[in-house]
């Protein structure tokens, strides 16, 4: 039987300063049991993007609506990118637990960020 | 139209072994979490375990006695309750759970129950 | 573990009248509060989750609202078949899922 899979869809996005980028993340299966987490860079120095449950993200928006059922789309907004936003962003599936642990990551997608227009 | 059915419930002695199933139809069993929840008569719901893929969940009063599994093949879930108690008698229910947003997991659809009864 | 206290235990009404079941949660829960109904001798219905959003084919006299540590179920209009028994449960941090200990409506 298929097991869960993480799907970011685009390798690479390249946003204007001062835009938003839109991070894709889908995922096949609602189990295993455990949330999603959105981080910039791999390993242990890899910077926390956005966790729904704990923490104050005020740049990040979910894509997905709050009340949508059975929900797969994992996909995120972050407003008014700055140049220091560049780097790959990773979407991964954790599986419930104390603590949570890593169950599988997504391929990662490289933000650019490019010259505001003038 | 999703459709649970519990059956295995009877009487059992207690420190006896009891299995019961339940046959879902209706959704995509295999890509589900799917839980037990037990009602002792006259009281109120008790969460007794959740199993999502291999991952699995359980109420401390269950736990090293209740073991919860699932044969997707089957669209099956299993409960096996070993070294029952007076305590363990209840009505079993199976219930989807289902997500809304990034969060989870409430119960959508139950079964109709099946009674398990441990007494001497 | 989050302990969920419903109030009252017992509710006692005509039909007509609007219906207003409390459930106070021992920590923050945010949204993730779910409520059911159940009569006797069936299975609980899903009615509400996510505080406040109501599941397919529920009539739009039962709504919910409260976010933290205090949510509510009102039903505007009780009707005849509305008799039973209410659970909240919470979802926000488990295991263990909670339950509150139920408010039981009974015809005056």
């Known amino acids: 039987e298929e097991e869960l899979q993480v799907i970011q869809p685009d390798k690479s996005v390249s946003v204007a300063a001062g835009e938003s980028a839109i991070l894709h993340c889908t995922v096949t299966s609602l189990i295993p049991v455990g949330p999603i987490q959105w981080f910039r860079g791999a390993g242990p120095a890899r910077e926390l993007i956005y966790n729904q449950k704990e923490g104050h993200f005020p740049r990040v928006t979910t894509v997905s609506e709050s009340t949508k059922r059975e929900n797969m789309d994992f996909s995120i907004s972050i407003s008014n990118i700055t140049p220091a936003d560049a780097g790959t962003y990773y979407c991964v599936k954790f599986r419930k637990g104390s603590p949570d642990t890593e169950f599988k990551s997504g391929a990662g997608t490289e933000l650019s960020v490019r010259a505001k227009p003038s | 139209e999703v459709q649970l059915v519990e059956s295995g419930g009877g009487v059992v002695q207690p420190g006896g072994s009891l299995r019961l199933s339940c046959a879902a139809s209706?959704?995509?069993?295999?890509?589900?979490?799917v839980s037990w929840v037990r009602q002792a008569p006259g009281k109120g719901l008790e969460w007794v375990s959740t199993i999502g893929a291999d991952d699995t969940y359980y109420a401390d009063s269950v736990k090293g006695r209740f073991t919860i599994s699932r044969d997707n093949s089957k669209n099956t879930l299993y409960l096996q309750m070993n070294s029952l108690r007076a305590e363990d008698t209840a009505v079993y229910y199976c219930a989807k759970d289902s997500t809304v947003g990034w969060s989870g997991d409430f119960f959508d659809y139950w079964g109709q129950g099946t009674l398990v009864t441990v007494s001497s | 573990e989050i302990v969920l206290t419903q109030s009252p235990a017992t509710l006692s009404v005509s039909p007509g009248e609007r219906v207003t079941f409390s459930c106070r949660a021992s920590?923050?829960?945010?949204?993730?509060i779910a409520w059911y109904q159940q009569k006797p001798g069936q299975a609980p219905r899903l009615l509400i989750y996510?505080?406040?959003s109501r599941d397919t084919g529920i009539p739009d006299r039962f709504s919910g609202s409260g976010s933290g540590t205090d949510f509510t179920l009102t039903i505007s209009s009780l009707q005849s078949e509305d008799f039973g028994v209410y659970y909240c449960q919470q979802y926000y941090d488990w295991p263990p899922f909670t339950f509150g200990g139920g408010t039981k409506v009974e015809i005056k």
């Open positions: 996510a505080a406040s």
């Open positions: 920590q923050n829960v945010r949204s993730d």
């Open positions: 209706g959704f995509s069993f295999s890509i589900y979490a």
